[in-house]
């Protein structure tokens, strides 16, 4: 049909910073590069409908879905999302085409589904249906790299079988310990699958996606370290690649390595050699141990030997399911307010796990310090000196645990007062809770000496309020007492405080806080 | 026995904020704690948070954290629930209810509630 | 947070006969700290028993709580014609403070 306008249908994706989205459906502003969505003509439709490609959007992002109609004249437009019709602006762009626009803002489950657009030009009408959805990231995975040896080459190949495709990157250092930390100068980073130079002192391969980042590192025995007091260890699940590479350096190329397990040699094509001189003419050799598939039997003592060195082992240990060892038992720590203090909780874990610290709701990130004995160990210290409840939670691919820490925190009473007709109360909020005293004010005991007993009604908290331990004293009202000052005071381990109340009249009492430490 | 009287009924307009207010008589004020319960038309009943008067400490339900401020004049036994960035689904009865802190009051379970205030939010 | 459910949803029983409204939650409730309310249409809430079994203040005797843990349990022991309402069960151990979502007593 030569009356057929060339249309043209866009989507594009605004970043989440992006000021320039507008909140009307008139065009916004934008730079990024617009995804062209085909638009073609429905067959064995009524009428002249144009269907663009169906777009996915992740929840919270922004996008456009924009028309350009080329065709003489004017054009009026509207919009309808589920039975609703939005406003509709076309303006014309530099070329002279038509430009209707749409703007979703903040992507939710509510704002997916079918948008039509109605188009009416001189020439002709018809419509444009575009399909949005939400991106369902249920589907996504990220999964922790792995190693295979690269065919008939002495290199490594590092795999991630993770969706969306996953950016492979290997973070290599030849520095010891602290210094190879992520941000430190030593640390070098290649985003490639294959790494060939395999003699560096750390080697870890890092896949990341919209899910977030997990590295797995080349296990390694340095034959010119000193062993660590306890064996290291090594985990893996039933069905996994198992790698360890066994690294030593000598002043000349005369010496040799060999792994075995449980004293008998590994068997042929389950390991394989690279050598190279160092910058000081000293050589180095490394001997990869390797099997593709483990199982339960391939469980035991791994001991890389040196003609030129003392031998070193590891014990791997094959599990057929992920765990997570640490005590789970509840902990209530008592502190001062001004005592530096930390949570910390000590496990044996496999895979890696992703853990949280939570207070009141708010999560806070978790870092995880692995220990020599095979235990890895994460500390709170952000506490800020706030009472209430903490909880670590750590979870892997099969497992999960949560521990609960409760921190109180050591403060004298503070008191404050509230009288009645009937009756005067005390509060504190001191911890540990307090004790109370109620003291007459009279010619007799100018100094609020005169102990009361009669009439009061102490109660310690039972549970916190709000995360408040709350305690309470109250006096009822007697003959004896009333016209006079009274004075209750709270006290504990960290000192006293007092209010005095004049006891007459209901109403606004004066109190005079006396703070006695 | 503490009453609770409410505020009366508001209509809101999307986008904009409530303040509900609440008033205690026939008690000490002090010695409770206030909550903030919502109902929904037809619904059941939801915790938004709650304060103790007399410490001025404030406790809020998470899912309405950063939207409701909640707030106490122990001066003139009023609590205040002030709801912002209001949307149609926040249409509801809003309730105060307390529970005893102090004295020979039971710490458990609000024994006493306000009438309720109708909080409509409409274009 | 706590999650409570409540069954049944909706128990249609005559006046004398016995309820029993259950509520179950996610994880244990610390010191059974369990209340339940009864709320008729237009009236706010009212409190019946907390602590799991102690019964308010002017609460008739008909009306008992029990359970601990996970299971707690309201039994009204003869309906009476002014106890056809709905029920709900909170619990205030641990913040956010949760209520379930109803049981409605009705009449048969």
């Known amino acids: 049909n030569q009356d057929l306008p060339v249309i043209k249908c866009v989507l594009i994706n605004h970043k989440n910073n992006d000021s320039s989205v507008g909140k009307s459906s008139s065009y916004p502003m934008v730079s990024e590069s617009p995804e062209d969505l085909g638009c073609a003509l429905r067959p064995q439709s009524s009428g002249t409908v144009y269907e663009a490609a169906a777009v996915e959007v992740d929840v919270s992002a922004s996008i456009t879905l924009q028309v350009l109609v080329d065709a003489p004249g004017n054009i009026s437009c509207l919009w309808v999302f589920k039975h609703s019709s939005l406003n509709c602006q076309p303006h014309f762009d530099l070329q002279n085409r038509g430009v209707v626009s749409m703007v979703i803002l903040k992507m939710t489950e509510t704002q997916a589904g079918e948008y039509l657009l109605f188009i009416q030009s001189e020439a002709t009408n018809y419509t444009i249906l575009f399909t949005v959805s939400i991106r369902n990231t249920l589907l996504y995975t990220l999964r922790r790299p792995y190693f295979r040896k690269m065919e008939n080459q002495d290199a490594l190949v590092c795999i991630s079988e993770s969706v969306p495709e996953p950016i492979v990157e290997w973070v290599l250092c030849d520095s010891q310990g602290e210094s190879c930390k992520e941000e430190s100068p030593a640390v070098v980073k290649k985003e490639e699958k294959v790494l060939h130079e395999l003699f560096g002192t750390d080697i870890r391969c890092c896949a990341r996606n919209e899910l977030g980042r997990e590295c797995t590192r080349l296990f390694t025995i340095d034959l010119n370290q000193t062993p660590q007091t306890t064996l290291p260890q090594l985990f893996l699940k039933v069905g996994e690649p198992l790698w360890i590479r066994c690294k030593a350096v000598h002043v000349n190329h005369g010496f040799g390595l060999t792994w075995e397990l449980e004293n008998k040699a590994l068997e042929e094509g389950n390991y394989f050699e690279m050598s190279t001189y160092s910058t000081n003419r000293t050589m180095i050799r490394i001997l990869f141990a390797f099997v593709s598939s483990v199982a339960r039997n391939d469980t035991g003592y791994y001991t890389c030997s040196s003609s030129k060195h003392p031998s070193q082992s590891a014990l791997v240990t094959i599990v057929e399911k992920g765990f997570i060892n640490a005590t789970n038992s509840s902990e209530d720590y008592e502190i001062d307010q001004y005592e530096e203090f930390c949570f910390s909780v000590r496990f044996k874990a496999y895979p890696q796990i992703r853990c949280t610290w939570t207070f009141s709701r708010k999560s806070f990130p978790c870092e995880q310090k692995g220990l020599d004995n095979g235990y890895s160990i994460s500390k709170f210290c952000n506490h800020k000196h706030q009472p209430g409840e903490y909880i670590f939670h750590a979870e892997n691919d099969d497992a999960q645990f949560t521990k609960m820490f409760t921190l109180n925190i050591r403060r004298k009473p503070q008191v404050l007062a509230e009288a009645s007709a009937s009756q005067a109360s005390c509060f504190s909020d001191g911890y540990p809770l307090p004790s109370w005293t109620w003291k007459k004010c009279s010619d007799k005991s100018p100094n609020c000496t005169e102990e009361i007993t009669e009439g009061v009604w102490n109660r310690k908290a039972n549970r916190k309020v709000f995360g408040q331990w709350v305690s309470s004293s109250t006096l009822n009202m007697s003959e004896a007492i009333k016209g006079f000052l009274v004075k209750c005071c709270a006290y504990n381990s960290l000192g006293t405080s007092c209010e005095t109340i004049l006891l007459n009249s209901p109403g606004p009492f004066p109190f005079i806080q006396d703070n006695i430490s | 026995q503490v009453q609770l009287v409410q505020s009366g009924a508001e209509v809101k307009k999307p986008g904009s904020s409530v303040k509900v207010s609440c008033k205690a008589s026939g008690g000490t004020f002090s010695s409770y704690a206030v909550s903030w319960v919502r109902q929904a038309p037809g619904q059941g009943l939801e915790w938004m948070g709650g304060?103790?008067?007399?410490?001025?400490?404030?406790n809020y339900a998470q899912k309405f954290q950063g939207r409701v401020t909640i707030t106490a004049d122990t001066s003139t036994s009023t609590a205040y629930m002030e709801l912002s960035s209001l949307r149609s689904e926040d249409t509801a009865v809003y309730y105060c209810a307390i529970e005893g802190i102090g004295g020979d009051l039971r710490y458990e379970g609000y024994d006493a509630w306000g009438q309720g205030t109708l909080v409509t939010v409409s274009s | 947070e706590i999650v409570l459910t409540q069954s049944p949803g909706t128990l249609s029983l005559s006046p004398g006969e016995r309820a029993t409204l259950s509520c179950r939650a996610s994880q244990s409730v610390s010191h059974s700290y369990l209340a339940w309310y009864q709320q008729k249409p237009g009236q706010a809430p009212r409190l019946l028993i907390y602590g799991a079994s102690f019964r308010a203040a002017g609460i008739p005797d008909r009306f008992s709580g029990s359970g601990s843990g996970t299971d707690f349990t309201l039994t009204i022991s003869r309906l009476e014609p002014e106890d056809f309402a709905v029920y709900y069960c909170q619990q205030y151990g641990s913040e956010p403070y949760t209520f379930g979502q109803g049981t409605k007593v009705e009449i048969k």
């Open positions: 304060i103790i008067p007399i410490f001025g400490i404030a």
